[in-house]
């Protein structure tokens, strides 16, 4: 095969698969290339596009057994092992800054196979629930990514605000008031891709009382302390990648 034909084939895409992949912050992530044996390959390239940074490429050329990097500064993003043994890419201790697009390009003599990942870093919000006025409770999901969703049982007269932080996290604050006096206990349910959490509080008829469900004060209980229930894993709560073929 002449050099011209090889060059032409480099731009021919034989198969492309793109996957959205939510990953919990502080976990390790392994991103995989298409299932093609090394014997069929000429070059393996990982292309990494992170927000506000120049595109980073990590390439391995089989013929010369050499690796090359361009514009790659994050030392936590590396080949899993020697690329001639394993072409996967690993991110050690995923951070918010790892949000972005990662693509493995496998160059064969007949064209390219692409496998792309839209990596969405998930941050578990800190949840608090307290009473700040008579028959009014405030539930906060602080610094989650993406924004959490807050619902109440029973439903009240609620106002929800979102506060966006520069690091990409969002604080959601829901303030609810219950006029109906037979409502004594209210539950705040926080839904998030990393899992769900519920806290409940007894509405105390004390004007100006500011009681916290996490404070363990009189008549206040955190469901999770009382029943030892932890975050229920949601669809995005997996530490390992599930491939879609």
């Amino acid at each position: 095969m002449d050099e011209k034909q090889i060059t032409q084939n480099y731009s021919k895409v034989l198969a492309e698969v793109n996957t959205s992949w939510p990953v919990k912050m502080a976990t390790n992530a392994v991103l995989c290339c298409p299932p093609i044996a090394l014997r069929n390959l000429i070059i393996i390239t990982w292309e990494i596009i992170l927000r506000g940074q120049p595109s980073c490429t990590k390439a391995y050329k089989k013929e010369t057994n050499e690796t090359k990097e361009t514009n790659c500064t994050d030392e936590r993003i590396t080949w899993v092992s020697r690329p001639d043994q394993n072409s996967d890419l690993q991110i050690r201790t995923v951070a918010i800054t790892h949000d972005g697009y990662y693509r493995c390009i496998m160059v064969t003599p007949d064209g390219n196979f692409h496998r792309g990942y839209h990596l969405q870093v998930l941050v578990t919000p800190e949840v608090t629930l307290f009473q700040n006025r008579n028959r009014t409770a405030v539930c906060k999901a602080v610094a989650g990514k993406p924004a959490a969703h807050i619902s109440w049982i029973p439903e009240g007269d609620c106002a929800t605000k979102q506060e966006y932080w520069s690091n990409g996290t969002v604080t959601v604050k829901s303030t609810c008031h219950w006029e109906v006096h037979n409502v004594s206990t209210v539950t705040c349910h926080v839904s998030h891709l990393t899992g769900n959490k519920s806290l409940y509080i007894e509405l105390l008829p004390v004007p100006g009382a500011k009681k916290s469900a996490k404070g363990g004060g009189s008549g206040l209980n955190d469901i999770f302390e009382a029943q030892k229930i932890e975050w229920h894993e949601g669809s995005g709560g997996h530490h390992h990648h599930h491939h879609h073929h």
Partner: antibody, heavy 119, light 110 residues
């Protein structure tokens, strides 16, 4: 249409050599790895080795190292498997098979060549 | 080398039956999120024909009554409703670094 056409049946004496050919058509011959597999009567399929015509890389099953030689003629789009020092237990149908990239699977096979080793 | 053990080695079944063939690898054939296990059908005097690749993917042109499942070391080929043309020998095969075939399962008419 991808096709792999193998040479005809052979009868050989013990100690002799045999060379089986596999002519490829319908695709760029140098772009795909060619495997050789054999099947003795009533036995499981057995891997002999492979050749990558793109760079002439070869790899052999330990069992056939030193006895099997895989070559290719790019101009003729043909792969060859030569087996020397033949024994009666080498009596088998020999297949060439093109390895498809995705998943390293064999979609295309030659029709098979029966090699009989008998004194 | 990875050894593949198929069971049963032969079975008798009738048209319309559900048939299950298993293949056990001596060590895991799953890596990088993929299971490098394929299934082939072979009829006398013919080369093998690919049915399933990467454990569960149906090869183009293969009837949907064929399906594959499994990961790690244990894999299954299922024929949901056996047809007259399905009486043949079936092989599992692994091909990541080295190529290995199972011993085969012959599906015969009851």
């Amino acid at each position: 249409e991808v096709q792999l056409v193998q040479s005809g049946a052979e009868v050989k004496k013990p100690g002799a050599s045999v060379k089986v050919s596999c002519k490829a058509s319908g695709y760029t011959f140098t772009s795909y790895v060619m495997f050789w597999v054999r099947q003795a009567p009533g036995q499981r399929l057995e891997w002999i080795g492979y050749i990558n015509p793109y760079n002439d890389d070869t790899k052999y099953n330990e069992k056939f190292k030193g006895r099997a030689t895989l070559t290719s003629d790019k101009s003729a789009s043909t792969a060859y498997m030569e087996l020397s020092s033949l024994r009666s237990e080498d009596t088998a149908v020999y297949y060439c098979a093109r390895e498809d990239y995705y998943g390293s699977r064999f979609v295309y096979w030659g029709q098979g060549t029966l090699v009989t080793v008998s004194s | 080398d990875i050894q593949l053990t198929q069971s049963p080695s032969s079975l008798s079944a009738s048209v319309g039956d559900r048939v299950t063939i298993t293949c056990r690898a001596s060590k895991s054939v799953s890596t990088s999120g993929y299971s490098y296990m394929h299934w082939y059908q072979q009829k006398p005097g013919k080369p093998p024909k690919l049915l399933i690749y990467l454990a569960s993917n149906l090869e183009s042109g293969v009837p949907s009554r064929f399906s594959g499942s499994g990961s790690g070391t244990d894999f299954t080929l299922t024929i949901s409703s056996l047809q007259p043309e399905d009486f043949a020998t079936y092989y599992c095969q692994h091909n990541r670094e080295l190529l290995t075939f199972g011993g085969g399962t012959k599906v015969e008419i009851k």
